[in-house]
Amino acid sequence: VPRWRQQWSGPGTTKRFPETVLARCVKYTEIHPEMRHVDCQSVWDAFKGAFISKHPCNITEEDYQPLMKLGTQTVPCNKILLWSRIKDLAHQFTQVQRDMFTLEDTLLGYLADDLTWCGEFNTSKINYQSCPDWRKDCSNNPVSVFWKTVSRRFAEAACDVVHVMLNGSRSKIFDKNSTFGSVEVHNLQPEKVQTLEAWVIHGGREDSRDLCQDPTIKELESIISKRNIQFSCKNIYRPDKFLQCVKNPEDSSCTSEI
Protein backbone atom coordinates (compact mmCIF):
# COMPACT_ATOMS: atom_id res chain seq x y z
CA VAL A 1 0.00 0.00 0.00
CA PRO A 2 1.57 3.32 -1.00
CA ARG A 3 2.21 5.54 1.98
CA TRP A 4 0.21 8.79 2.12
CA ARG A 5 2.34 11.76 1.13
CA GLN A 6 1.67 15.42 1.91
CA GLN A 7 0.92 17.38 -1.25
CA TRP A 8 2.34 20.88 -1.21
CA SER A 9 1.53 23.76 -3.53
CA GLY A 10 5.07 24.38 -4.74
CA PRO A 11 7.31 22.43 -7.12
CA GLY A 12 9.18 19.48 -5.71
CA THR A 13 12.89 19.11 -5.08
CA THR A 14 15.01 19.79 -8.14
CA LYS A 15 15.86 16.51 -9.83
CA ARG A 16 19.31 15.13 -9.03
CA PHE A 17 19.51 17.59 -6.12
CA PRO A 18 22.23 15.76 -4.12
CA GLU A 19 24.41 15.30 -7.20
CA THR A 20 23.90 18.92 -8.23
CA VAL A 21 24.88 20.32 -4.83
CA LEU A 22 27.96 18.11 -4.61
CA ALA A 23 29.04 18.91 -8.17
CA ARG A 24 28.53 22.63 -7.63
CA CYS A 25 30.58 22.51 -4.46
CA VAL A 26 33.48 20.78 -6.21
CA LYS A 27 33.30 23.23 -9.10
CA TYR A 28 33.17 26.23 -6.77
CA THR A 29 36.24 25.17 -4.82
CA GLU A 30 38.11 24.79 -8.12
CA ILE A 31 37.05 28.23 -9.37
CA HIS A 32 37.81 29.77 -5.97
CA PRO A 33 41.08 28.19 -4.77
CA GLU A 34 40.95 30.05 -1.45
CA MET A 35 38.05 27.68 -0.62
CA ARG A 36 40.02 24.53 -1.46
CA HIS A 37 40.00 23.52 2.21
CA VAL A 38 36.27 22.83 2.01
CA ASP A 39 35.28 19.17 2.17
CA CYS A 40 32.35 18.99 -0.24
CA GLN A 41 31.07 15.67 1.10
CA SER A 42 30.82 17.23 4.57
CA VAL A 43 29.07 20.24 3.05
CA TRP A 44 26.48 18.00 1.43
CA ASP A 45 26.00 16.03 4.65
CA ALA A 46 25.39 19.28 6.54
CA PHE A 47 23.03 20.56 3.86
CA LYS A 48 21.08 17.29 3.92
CA GLY A 49 20.99 17.31 7.70
CA ALA A 50 19.25 20.68 7.69
CA PHE A 51 16.03 19.38 6.13
CA ILE A 52 16.00 15.57 5.86
CA SER A 53 13.55 13.83 8.25
CA LYS A 54 12.18 17.22 9.33
CA HIS A 55 8.73 18.63 8.72
CA PRO A 56 9.17 21.00 5.77
CA CYS A 57 7.08 23.68 7.46
CA ASN A 58 9.08 23.59 10.66
CA ILE A 59 12.61 24.43 9.53
CA THR A 60 14.66 26.91 11.58
CA GLU A 61 17.82 28.90 11.02
CA GLU A 62 19.39 26.67 13.67
CA ASP A 63 18.93 23.68 11.35
CA TYR A 64 21.30 25.35 8.89
CA GLN A 65 24.02 26.28 11.36
CA PRO A 66 26.29 23.27 10.65
CA LEU A 67 26.14 24.16 6.94
CA MET A 68 26.77 27.84 7.67
CA LYS A 69 29.84 26.90 9.68
CA LEU A 70 31.29 24.69 6.94
CA GLY A 71 30.55 27.32 4.31
CA THR A 72 32.10 30.20 6.22
CA GLN A 73 33.71 32.47 3.67
CA THR A 74 35.36 35.86 3.73
CA VAL A 75 34.36 38.25 0.99
CA PRO A 76 35.67 41.83 0.94
CA CYS A 77 33.04 43.57 3.04
CA ASN A 78 33.23 46.74 0.94
CA LYS A 79 32.63 44.91 -2.34
CA ILE A 80 29.13 43.57 -1.74
CA LEU A 81 26.36 43.89 -4.33
CA LEU A 82 22.82 43.20 -3.18
CA TRP A 83 19.99 42.91 -5.70
CA SER A 84 16.23 42.67 -5.82
CA ARG A 85 14.21 41.26 -8.73
CA ILE A 86 17.11 41.73 -11.15
CA LYS A 87 19.35 38.77 -10.47
CA ASP A 88 20.61 38.16 -14.01
CA LEU A 89 22.03 41.65 -14.50
CA ALA A 90 23.58 41.62 -11.02
CA HIS A 91 25.33 38.35 -11.87
CA GLN A 92 26.44 39.60 -15.28
CA PHE A 93 27.92 42.61 -13.50
CA THR A 94 29.96 40.61 -10.96
CA GLN A 95 31.17 38.28 -13.72
CA VAL A 96 32.81 41.32 -15.28
CA GLN A 97 33.64 43.27 -12.12
CA ARG A 98 35.34 40.30 -10.52
CA ASP A 99 36.21 42.00 -7.25
CA MET A 100 32.51 42.48 -6.37
CA PHE A 101 30.28 39.77 -4.96
CA THR A 102 26.61 38.94 -4.92
CA LEU A 103 25.32 36.33 -2.50
CA GLU A 104 25.33 33.81 -5.36
CA ASP A 105 29.05 34.44 -5.85
CA THR A 106 29.66 32.90 -2.42
CA LEU A 107 29.85 29.15 -1.92
CA LEU A 108 26.50 28.76 -0.14
CA GLY A 109 24.65 31.02 -2.55
CA TYR A 110 26.22 29.25 -5.51
CA LEU A 111 25.21 25.84 -4.18
CA ALA A 112 21.53 26.69 -3.83
CA ASP A 113 20.92 29.17 -6.65
CA ASP A 114 17.72 28.29 -8.57
CA LEU A 115 17.26 25.01 -6.68
CA THR A 116 14.30 23.73 -4.66
CA TRP A 117 14.45 21.12 -1.92
CA CYS A 118 12.48 19.64 0.94
CA GLY A 119 12.15 16.42 2.88
CA GLU A 120 9.45 14.69 4.89
CA PHE A 121 8.95 14.32 8.60
CA ASN A 122 10.35 11.07 9.98
CA THR A 123 11.64 9.69 6.70
CA SER A 124 15.03 10.05 5.10
CA LYS A 125 13.45 10.59 1.69
CA ILE A 126 13.77 13.75 -0.37
CA ASN A 127 10.41 14.93 -1.70
CA TYR A 128 10.67 15.25 -5.46
CA GLN A 129 6.89 15.62 -5.92
CA SER A 130 6.13 18.88 -4.15
CA CYS A 131 7.52 21.32 -1.59
CA PRO A 132 5.82 24.01 0.46
CA ASP A 133 5.05 27.31 -1.24
CA TRP A 134 6.01 30.37 0.83
CA ARG A 135 2.57 32.00 0.43
CA LYS A 136 0.19 29.09 0.03
CA ASP A 137 1.71 26.66 2.53
CA CYS A 138 4.24 28.04 5.01
CA SER A 139 7.13 30.47 5.29
CA ASN A 140 9.37 28.25 7.43
CA ASN A 141 10.14 25.89 4.57
CA PRO A 142 13.67 24.65 3.79
CA VAL A 143 14.31 26.95 0.82
CA SER A 144 12.93 30.15 2.37
CA VAL A 145 14.72 29.62 5.67
CA PHE A 146 17.98 28.90 3.85
CA TRP A 147 17.84 32.15 1.85
CA LYS A 148 16.76 34.13 4.89
CA THR A 149 19.74 32.73 6.83
CA VAL A 150 22.41 33.28 4.20
CA SER A 151 20.98 36.69 3.21
CA ARG A 152 21.06 37.88 6.82
CA ARG A 153 24.66 36.75 7.26
CA PHE A 154 25.69 38.32 3.95
CA ALA A 155 24.15 41.68 4.89
CA GLU A 156 25.68 41.55 8.36
CA ALA A 157 29.13 41.13 6.81
CA ALA A 158 28.84 44.23 4.62
CA CYS A 159 30.79 47.43 5.30
CA ASP A 160 31.60 50.88 3.89
CA VAL A 161 29.56 51.46 0.72
CA VAL A 162 27.05 48.71 -0.06
CA HIS A 163 25.46 48.64 -3.51
CA VAL A 164 22.04 47.32 -4.40
CA MET A 165 20.67 46.78 -7.89
CA LEU A 166 16.91 47.37 -8.18
CA ASN A 167 14.54 46.70 -11.07
CA GLY A 168 13.07 49.97 -12.32
CA SER A 169 10.56 48.13 -14.51
CA ARG A 170 8.56 46.79 -11.59
CA SER A 171 5.61 48.54 -9.99
CA LYS A 172 7.41 48.36 -6.65
CA ILE A 173 11.02 49.21 -7.41
CA PHE A 174 11.74 48.68 -3.72
CA ASP A 175 9.57 45.94 -2.25
CA LYS A 176 9.48 45.63 1.52
CA ASN A 177 8.48 41.99 1.15
CA SER A 178 11.47 40.98 -0.97
CA THR A 179 14.48 39.32 0.63
CA PHE A 180 16.33 42.60 0.22
CA GLY A 181 13.50 44.60 1.80
CA SER A 182 12.62 42.21 4.60
CA VAL A 183 16.01 40.74 5.52
CA GLU A 184 19.06 42.47 4.06
CA VAL A 185 18.05 46.10 4.67
CA HIS A 186 17.43 45.38 8.34
CA ASN A 187 20.69 43.50 8.85
CA LEU A 188 23.12 46.05 7.46
CA GLN A 189 25.22 47.13 10.43
CA PRO A 190 25.18 50.94 10.90
CA GLU A 191 28.50 50.84 12.76
CA LYS A 192 30.13 49.28 9.68
CA VAL A 193 28.05 50.48 6.72
CA GLN A 194 28.43 54.12 5.76
CA THR A 195 26.24 54.27 2.65
CA LEU A 196 23.72 52.17 0.77
CA GLU A 197 23.89 53.11 -2.90
CA ALA A 198 20.93 52.01 -5.02
CA TRP A 199 21.31 51.46 -8.74
CA VAL A 200 17.87 51.66 -10.36
CA ILE A 201 17.96 49.77 -13.63
CA HIS A 202 15.71 51.16 -16.36
CA GLY A 203 13.87 48.81 -18.71
CA GLY A 204 12.65 50.95 -21.60
CA ARG A 205 15.17 52.43 -24.00
CA GLU A 206 13.38 55.79 -24.05
CA ASP A 207 12.74 55.88 -20.31
CA SER A 208 14.41 59.07 -19.10
CA ARG A 209 12.47 59.47 -15.85
CA ASP A 210 14.36 59.92 -12.60
CA LEU A 211 13.31 56.70 -10.91
CA CYS A 212 15.29 57.70 -7.84
CA GLN A 213 12.28 59.90 -7.07
CA ASP A 214 9.94 56.89 -7.05
CA PRO A 215 7.85 56.68 -3.84
CA THR A 216 9.21 53.21 -3.04
CA ILE A 217 12.80 54.50 -3.34
CA LYS A 218 11.89 57.32 -0.96
CA GLU A 219 10.53 54.66 1.38
CA LEU A 220 13.84 52.78 1.16
CA GLU A 221 15.73 56.02 1.82
CA SER A 222 13.59 56.63 4.91
CA ILE A 223 14.18 53.11 6.29
CA ILE A 224 17.93 53.37 5.67
CA SER A 225 18.24 56.90 7.09
CA LYS A 226 16.41 55.84 10.26
CA ARG A 227 19.09 53.18 10.67
CA ASN A 228 21.80 55.89 10.57
CA ILE A 229 23.08 54.78 7.18
CA GLN A 230 23.46 57.27 4.36
CA PHE A 231 21.54 56.66 1.15
CA SER A 232 22.35 57.51 -2.44
CA CYS A 233 20.67 56.56 -5.68
CA LYS A 234 21.69 56.40 -9.33
CA ASN A 235 19.63 55.81 -12.45
CA ILE A 236 21.10 53.27 -14.85
CA TYR A 237 19.27 54.33 -18.01
CA ARG A 238 21.08 51.92 -20.33
CA PRO A 239 21.91 48.63 -18.61
CA ASP A 240 23.49 47.25 -21.80
CA LYS A 241 25.80 50.25 -22.04
CA PHE A 242 26.41 50.07 -18.29
CA LEU A 243 27.77 46.52 -18.59
CA GLN A 244 29.78 47.43 -21.67
CA CYS A 245 31.39 50.31 -19.80
CA VAL A 246 32.22 48.07 -16.86
CA LYS A 247 34.02 45.82 -19.34
CA ASN A 248 35.72 48.70 -21.16
CA PRO A 249 35.81 51.74 -18.87
CA GLU A 250 38.27 53.58 -21.12
CA ASP A 251 35.73 53.66 -23.98
CA SER A 252 35.07 57.31 -24.91
CA SER A 253 31.28 56.82 -24.79
CA CYS A 254 31.51 55.81 -21.13
CA THR A 255 32.05 59.33 -19.80
CA SER A 256 28.42 60.29 -20.46
CA GLU A 257 25.55 59.24 -18.21
CA ILE A 258 24.54 55.60 -18.53
Epitope: I31, H32, P33, E34, R36, V75, D99
Partner: antibody
Amino acid sequence: SVEESGGRLVTPGTPLTLTCTASGFSLSSYYMSWVRQAPGKGLEWIGFISKTAITYYASWARGRFTISKTSTAVDLKITSPTTEDTATYFCARVDAYSAGDLWGPGTLVTVSS
Amino acid sequence: AQVLTQTPSSVSAAVGGTVTINCQASQSVYSDNRLSWFQQKSGQPPKLLIYSTSSLASGVPSRFSGSGSGTQFTLTISGVQSDDAASYYCQGEFICTSADCFVFGGGTEVVVK
Protein backbone atom coordinates in the same frame (compact mmCIF):
# COMPACT_ATOMS: atom_id res chain seq x y z
CA SER B 1 57.66 13.46 -3.09
CA VAL B 2 57.90 15.83 -6.05
CA GLU B 3 60.76 16.33 -8.46
CA GLU B 4 61.37 18.87 -11.20
CA SER B 5 63.24 18.18 -14.42
CA GLY B 6 63.97 19.84 -17.74
CA GLY B 7 66.08 22.76 -16.55
CA ARG B 8 68.99 23.60 -18.86
CA LEU B 9 70.79 26.38 -20.68
CA VAL B 10 68.62 27.91 -23.41
CA THR B 11 68.97 30.88 -25.72
CA PRO B 12 66.51 33.79 -25.38
CA GLY B 13 63.22 33.14 -27.18
CA THR B 14 63.58 29.35 -27.23
CA PRO B 15 60.53 27.82 -25.50
CA LEU B 16 61.33 25.49 -22.62
CA THR B 17 59.12 23.03 -20.77
CA LEU B 18 59.83 21.94 -17.21
CA THR B 19 58.19 18.86 -15.74
CA CYS B 20 57.16 18.12 -12.18
CA THR B 21 56.67 14.46 -11.34
CA ALA B 22 54.74 13.43 -8.25
CA SER B 23 55.02 10.19 -6.35
CA GLY B 24 53.20 8.95 -3.27
CA PHE B 25 50.10 11.03 -3.92
CA SER B 26 47.66 11.66 -6.76
CA LEU B 27 47.76 14.85 -8.80
CA SER B 28 43.98 14.61 -9.10
CA SER B 29 43.74 15.31 -5.36
CA TYR B 30 45.97 18.39 -5.13
CA TYR B 31 46.63 21.78 -6.62
CA MET B 32 50.23 22.08 -7.80
CA SER B 33 52.20 25.31 -7.79
CA TRP B 34 55.27 26.64 -9.58
CA VAL B 35 57.59 29.05 -7.80
CA ARG B 36 60.91 30.42 -9.00
CA GLN B 37 63.99 31.96 -7.41
CA ALA B 38 66.54 34.00 -9.33
CA PRO B 39 70.15 33.60 -8.12
CA GLY B 40 70.54 35.37 -4.78
CA LYS B 41 66.92 36.61 -4.85
CA GLY B 42 63.66 35.78 -3.14
CA LEU B 43 60.80 33.43 -3.97
CA GLU B 44 58.38 34.39 -6.73
CA TRP B 45 55.03 32.63 -7.23
CA ILE B 46 54.35 31.91 -10.92
CA GLY B 47 51.03 30.11 -10.83
CA PHE B 48 49.24 26.88 -10.08
CA ILE B 49 46.95 24.30 -11.57
CA SER B 50 43.88 22.94 -9.83
CA LYS B 51 42.75 19.36 -9.40
CA THR B 52 40.66 19.64 -12.55
CA ALA B 53 43.36 21.55 -14.47
CA ILE B 54 42.08 25.11 -14.01
CA THR B 55 45.11 27.41 -14.09
CA TYR B 56 45.87 30.59 -12.16
CA TYR B 57 48.85 32.84 -12.79
CA ALA B 58 50.53 35.76 -11.08
CA SER B 59 49.67 38.96 -12.96
CA TRP B 60 53.30 39.37 -14.08
CA ALA B 61 53.45 35.77 -15.35
CA ARG B 62 50.34 35.75 -17.57
CA GLY B 63 51.26 35.11 -21.18
CA ARG B 64 54.85 34.28 -20.28
CA PHE B 65 54.15 30.85 -18.78
CA THR B 66 51.71 28.01 -19.38
CA ILE B 67 50.93 25.35 -16.79
CA SER B 68 49.35 22.05 -17.80
CA LYS B 69 49.05 18.57 -16.35
CA THR B 70 48.68 14.88 -17.13
CA SER B 71 47.73 12.20 -14.64
CA THR B 72 51.36 11.82 -13.59
CA ALA B 73 53.05 15.18 -14.12
CA VAL B 74 52.63 18.94 -14.14
CA ASP B 75 54.37 20.96 -16.82
CA LEU B 76 55.53 24.57 -16.86
CA LYS B 77 56.21 26.01 -20.28
CA ILE B 78 58.28 29.19 -20.48
CA THR B 79 56.91 30.49 -23.76
CA SER B 80 59.69 32.88 -24.77
CA PRO B 81 62.46 32.96 -22.19
CA THR B 82 64.48 36.11 -21.52
CA THR B 83 67.62 36.49 -19.43
CA GLU B 84 65.37 37.63 -16.54
CA ASP B 85 63.90 34.12 -16.45
CA THR B 86 67.20 32.66 -15.28
CA ALA B 87 66.26 31.02 -11.98
CA THR B 88 65.75 27.80 -10.05
CA TYR B 89 62.20 26.62 -10.66
CA PHE B 90 60.40 24.80 -7.86
CA CYS B 91 57.28 22.68 -8.02
CA ALA B 92 55.23 22.49 -4.83
CA ARG B 93 52.17 20.62 -3.68
CA VAL B 94 49.58 23.12 -2.50
CA ASP B 95 47.88 22.10 0.72
CA ALA B 96 44.60 23.37 2.13
CA TYR B 97 46.02 26.47 3.77
CA SER B 98 49.40 27.34 2.23
CA ALA B 99 51.34 27.64 -1.02
CA GLY B 100 53.12 24.36 -0.46
CA ASP B 101 53.64 21.63 2.10
CA LEU B 102 55.85 19.53 -0.17
CA TRP B 103 58.55 20.95 -2.46
CA GLY B 104 60.86 19.50 -5.07
CA PRO B 105 64.60 20.24 -5.00
CA GLY B 106 64.26 22.62 -7.94
CA THR B 107 65.63 22.69 -11.47
CA LEU B 108 67.95 25.39 -12.78
CA VAL B 109 67.10 27.28 -15.96
CA THR B 110 69.77 29.52 -17.46
CA VAL B 111 68.79 31.84 -20.31
CA SER B 112 71.80 33.21 -22.12
CA SER B 113 72.87 33.99 -25.66
CA ALA C 1 48.94 44.10 -7.15
CA GLN C 2 49.35 43.07 -3.53
CA VAL C 3 52.73 43.43 -1.87
CA LEU C 4 54.12 41.70 1.22
CA THR C 5 56.85 43.72 2.89
CA GLN C 6 59.17 41.84 5.23
CA THR C 7 61.30 43.57 7.85
CA PRO C 8 64.11 43.45 8.62
CA SER C 9 65.82 42.13 5.48
CA SER C 10 68.57 40.69 7.68
CA VAL C 11 68.86 40.01 11.40
CA SER C 12 71.61 38.63 13.59
CA ALA C 13 70.91 36.72 16.80
CA ALA C 14 72.87 34.88 19.45
CA VAL C 15 72.13 31.26 20.24
CA GLY C 16 69.33 31.21 22.81
CA GLY C 17 68.11 34.66 21.80
CA THR C 18 64.86 35.68 20.17
CA VAL C 19 64.25 36.75 16.58
CA THR C 20 61.16 38.61 15.40
CA ILE C 21 60.36 39.01 11.70
CA ASN C 22 57.50 41.21 10.52
CA CYS C 23 55.41 40.86 7.40
CA GLN C 24 53.05 43.60 6.28
CA ALA C 25 50.53 43.06 3.47
CA SER C 26 49.28 45.91 1.29
CA GLN C 27 45.77 44.49 1.68
CA SER C 28 44.20 41.96 4.03
CA VAL C 29 45.04 38.35 3.30
CA TYR C 30 42.16 35.96 2.72
CA SER C 31 40.06 35.38 5.84
CA ASP C 32 42.49 37.70 7.69
CA ASN C 33 44.63 34.67 8.53
CA ARG C 34 45.81 32.98 5.31
CA LEU C 35 49.47 33.76 5.93
CA SER C 36 52.28 31.18 5.91
CA TRP C 37 55.98 31.24 6.80
CA PHE C 38 58.68 29.28 4.98
CA GLN C 39 62.28 28.55 5.92
CA GLN C 40 64.90 28.13 3.21
CA LYS C 41 68.46 27.05 3.75
CA SER C 42 71.14 27.60 1.14
CA GLY C 43 70.85 25.23 -1.81
CA GLN C 44 67.60 23.71 -0.52
CA PRO C 45 63.92 24.16 -1.36
CA PRO C 46 61.68 26.12 1.02
CA LYS C 47 60.14 24.29 3.96
CA LEU C 48 56.71 25.13 5.38
CA LEU C 49 56.96 26.27 9.00
CA ILE C 50 53.65 27.92 9.80
CA TYR C 51 50.30 28.14 8.02
CA SER C 52 47.08 30.02 8.80
CA THR C 53 49.09 32.65 10.70
CA SER C 54 49.85 30.55 13.77
CA SER C 55 49.46 26.81 13.06
CA LEU C 56 52.71 24.86 13.23
CA ALA C 57 53.42 22.58 10.27
CA SER C 58 54.16 18.94 11.00
CA GLY C 59 57.58 18.32 12.58
CA VAL C 60 58.36 22.01 13.17
CA PRO C 61 59.83 22.77 16.62
CA SER C 62 57.65 24.75 19.02
CA ARG C 63 60.24 27.53 19.28
CA PHE C 64 58.73 28.83 16.04
CA SER C 65 55.49 30.76 16.46
CA GLY C 66 53.36 33.05 14.35
CA SER C 67 50.84 35.76 15.13
CA GLY C 68 48.92 38.59 13.53
CA SER C 69 45.78 39.28 11.53
CA GLY C 70 44.64 41.09 8.42
CA THR C 71 47.70 42.93 7.15
CA GLN C 72 50.23 42.63 10.00
CA PHE C 73 51.99 39.38 10.85
CA THR C 74 54.96 38.23 12.89
CA LEU C 75 57.19 35.18 13.00
CA THR C 76 59.00 34.68 16.28
CA ILE C 77 61.88 32.27 16.91
CA SER C 78 62.36 31.87 20.65
CA GLY C 79 65.57 30.25 21.89
CA VAL C 80 67.32 30.49 18.55
CA GLN C 81 69.56 27.56 17.60
CA SER C 82 72.41 27.51 15.11
CA ASP C 83 70.30 25.29 12.86
CA ASP C 84 67.85 28.21 12.43
CA ALA C 85 70.29 30.14 10.27
CA ALA C 86 68.35 30.50 7.02
CA SER C 87 66.20 32.82 4.95
CA TYR C 88 62.56 33.17 6.02
CA TYR C 89 59.69 34.12 3.73
CA CYS C 90 56.12 35.07 4.49
CA GLN C 91 53.48 34.11 1.93
CA GLY C 92 49.99 35.56 1.78
CA GLU C 93 46.93 34.22 0.01
CA PHE C 94 44.29 36.37 -1.64
CA ILE C 95 41.04 35.88 -3.57
CA CYS C 96 42.19 34.65 -6.97
CA THR C 97 39.38 36.15 -9.01
CA SER C 98 40.40 39.70 -8.14
CA ALA C 99 44.11 39.42 -7.27
CA ASP C 100 47.18 37.18 -7.40
CA CYS C 101 46.39 34.02 -5.44
CA PHE C 102 49.76 33.82 -3.68
CA VAL C 103 52.37 36.48 -2.95
CA PHE C 104 55.72 36.01 -1.19
CA GLY C 105 57.47 38.57 0.96
CA GLY C 106 61.00 39.64 0.05
CA GLY C 107 62.65 37.43 2.65
CA THR C 108 64.63 37.88 5.84
CA GLU C 109 68.08 36.39 6.37
CA VAL C 110 68.68 35.16 9.90
CA VAL C 111 72.32 34.91 10.94
CA VAL C 112 73.09 33.02 14.16
CA LYS C 113 76.22 34.03 16.02
